[in-house]
Interface confidence: low
Amino acid sequence: EEELQMIQPEKLLLVTVGKTATLHCTVTSLLPVGPVLWFRGVGPGRELIYNQKEGHFPRVTTVSDLTKRNNMDFSIRISSITPADVGTYYCVKFRKGSPENVEFKSGPGTEMALGAKPSAPVVSGPAVRATPEHTVSFTCESHGFSPRDITLKWFKNGNELSDFQTNVDPAGDSVSYSIHSTARVVLTRGDVHSQVICEIAHITLQGDPLRGTANLSEAIRVPPTLEVTQQPMRAENQANVTCQVSNFYPRGLQLTWLENGNVSRTETASTLIENKDGTYNWMSWLLVNTCAHRDDVVLTCQVEHDGQQAVSKSYALEIS
Amino acid sequence: EEELQMIQPEKLLLVTVGKTATLHCTVTSLLPVGPVLWFRGVGPGRELIYNQKEGHFPRVTTVSDLTKRNNMDFSIRISSITPADVGTYYCVKFRKGSPENVEFKSGPGTEMALGAKPSAPVVSGPAVRATPEHTVSFTCESHGFSPRDITLKWFKNGNELSDFQTNVDPAGDSVSYSIHSTARVVLTRGDVHSQVICEIAHITLQGDPLRGTANLSEAIRVPPTLEVTQQPMRAENQANVTCQVSNFYPRGLQLTWLENGNVSRTETASTLIENKDGTYNWMSWLLVNTCAHRDDVVLTCQVEHDGQQAVSKSYALEIS
């Protein structure tokens, strides 16, 4: 006759508090005659978890009908898991005997361990904006997970980043853990619409990673380019000079016209044109009464963008 | 003879993973003769934790020397605690008998539960500044603690706040918990130097609460007050008008002088005077050539503070 095997297919079973755990056990033979019991632990202090014949086990149910004659599946379900339930569970075959049954063979055991899902990752950007070609740091945090093994990846617009540093705390044993990662991202002029993503994979997530995002629009400042040009005018004694302010982000912009160094007009940009890349353009013009000037006039367009130091562009207007 | 009492003084023992737990048990009598054993749980499935006479219990040590004749202390220490150790522990007296000892009396039991310290609270303020008399929200977060019971208090400059809402997640059983609290703080003009503190008390902290702080200087905007006055001048054909910009915060300020509505000069505040309450003062002056004017002149001091809409104060200069 074939020798009885006790098959417990899972070496490790990860469960979360409050859920139901299924412990699998199948036998390869109906012989010898005798019951299958479940224990936690080994040795004289082992704890009886389920005995079909006697005892009261309110949280345990069987997967199959153990009263069926040729049942070979002795798997059980334990409901409302608590931290007190962790340990190694053995399904054990007894041989019918007199005056009492005798232990015959034990399964290899399934270790039940507690898992806890990581919290949704929170991504934070820098406190102050930076300009293209500069490097900014983003942080990602997630808490409350167990076990400690976890994978964290950073992406910018779907491309994986490599310049980051990650810590999992605490270093020693704990009931749960936290992860903290800092990624360094080099900004480019086209990053107004860009996104960074922090992606966390953990055994409790069953293959569906958690993601946290941040928009680079909160972190970037694209300074404007200025161009001052003279437009043709019908009226002889007037000159129309325009200042084209291009490709800036964020919106906040103040423009001052100076004539030979004296303030002529100050205005705040309002109706802006948005470019495809998320930056803005704006145009301002100045009408100069040429008859009020004997000599050539230097016109300066001075722009203060997002509270930064002003930049300017000048134009020499010839008075003929 | 005095009846034997089994004293287990702690009803609940809170332990952290990796540490050593001490389970106290004392007896009031040496009689009847027989050993004291430790079990986890009750009934036929209870687990033997310690038996002085037989078995191997590598993580268990006794507090007292059990070999001493009149020892009455049967307390034990369990090292390297893991989540699998939680449960209710009973010290049980057996009466010596033949062929085996008979259970005589059990202690009331000590429940061992897992504790985990909360992480350092992180306090975040509002994304945009607000002005005095307005209400701003601050959030406080801490993670990874167990058990769920926790106390969170808010303080502003040492005074306890009452307008806040706190959530502890998850609502059900978990291996660890997170707390999130939002406090509403009414700003006053003197709050530039103020601080809000989030204080967390938890049983694992042994009486030293954790604190997170935030400065209201990051959350407040104190708009300036303007005063335009004429100063006495020696020269007959000149008038000196000053604009006193008082009690503003933060620093960023741009001032424009207008003569009869036309821009005369724009300047950015640089050398500021700091007041005791953390706000700033600044003064700007304008020299007006009165001989260039036939009629009275309206001088306007226009101030744009911290990117907000400009405020202005006018002064009518009489040309005699």
């Epitope: - | 003084p9 702690e10 001490t22 106290h24 507090v63 106390t151 208090k153 303080f155 040492g158 306890e160 503190i197 204080e199 008390a201 049983i203 042994q206 009486g207 030293d208 609460p209 604190r211």
Partner: antibody, heavy 122, light 107 residues
């Protein structure tokens, strides 16, 4: 670091009163009961009483009721004890210490002030 | 009130020796007992809380234990700075009471 700074040595006449202070720094004052303890010359320690700054709740050792009065000023994180109708028996060093507002074992009498010496003499 | 009877009131010992001080409680105080150390200049420091828990920064040669209503402070391997005064203190019920103290002197 948590510290308690107590006021300096006092020489007082019989029948008068003395008021001593204990200023806490390094932690939130309002989270704790502030306790006072007496030590007579060459003698042991005696618990006088305690005050909870949040609501000025006080608890006294019966032996010191009417003799000692405990107060606090939360804005300065300072606890005060006034000892009245002084006699030679009141000559002692007085200590302040604290316990947490939860009854947590680890938080009882961890930190102590350096003591204030009161000498009562005609 | 709970009486705390501390013994001995004074004790002479040599460097490196192991000594035990005892406090007996007149009523049940569970594990709610502290051991305090007082320097000659009056400075008070807590060594042990909850009968047997060692305060951080306190050398491992100090330990606390309990047998019934008897609470012990043991110093294994006396060092020169240990020859000072020691008090037990119960905080199970108000009024909180101290033992009479033990003066530890060098032989």
């Amino acid at each position: 670091e948590v510290q308690f700074q107590q006021s300096g040595t006092v020489l007082a006449r019989p029948g008068t009163s003395v008021k001593m202070s204990c200023k806490a720094s390094g932690s939130t004052f309002t989270s704790y009961w502030m306790h006072w303890v007496k030590q007579g010359p060459g003698q042991g320690l005696q618990w006088i009483g305690a005050i909870y700054p949040v609501n000025n709740d006080t608890t006294y050792n019966q032996k010191f009721k009417g003799k000692a009065e405990l107060t606090v000023v939360t804005s300065t994180s300072t606890a005060y004890m006034e000892v009245s109708s002084l006699t030679n028996e009141d000559s002692a060093v007085y200590y302040c210490t604290r316990s947490f507002y939860y009854s947590l074992d680890a938080a009882w009498f961890v930190y102590w002030g350096q003591g204030t010496l009161v000498t009562v003499s005609a | 009130d709970i009486q705390m009877t501390q013994s001995p009131s004074s004790l002479s010992a040599s460097l490196g020796e192991r000594v035990s001080l005892t406090c007996r409680a007149s009523q049940d105080i569970g594990s709610r007992l502290n051991w305090l150390q007082q320097e000659p200049d009056g400075t008070i420091k807590r060594l042990i809380y909850a009968t047997s828990s060692l305060d951080s920064g306190v050398p491992k040669r100090f330990s606390g234990s309990r047998s019934g209503s008897d609470y012990s402070l043991t110093i294994s391997g006396l060092e020169s700075e240990d020859f000072v005064d020691y008090y037990c203190l119960q905080y199970a019920s108000s009024p909180f009471t101290f033992g009479g103290g033990t003066k530890l002197e060098i032989n």
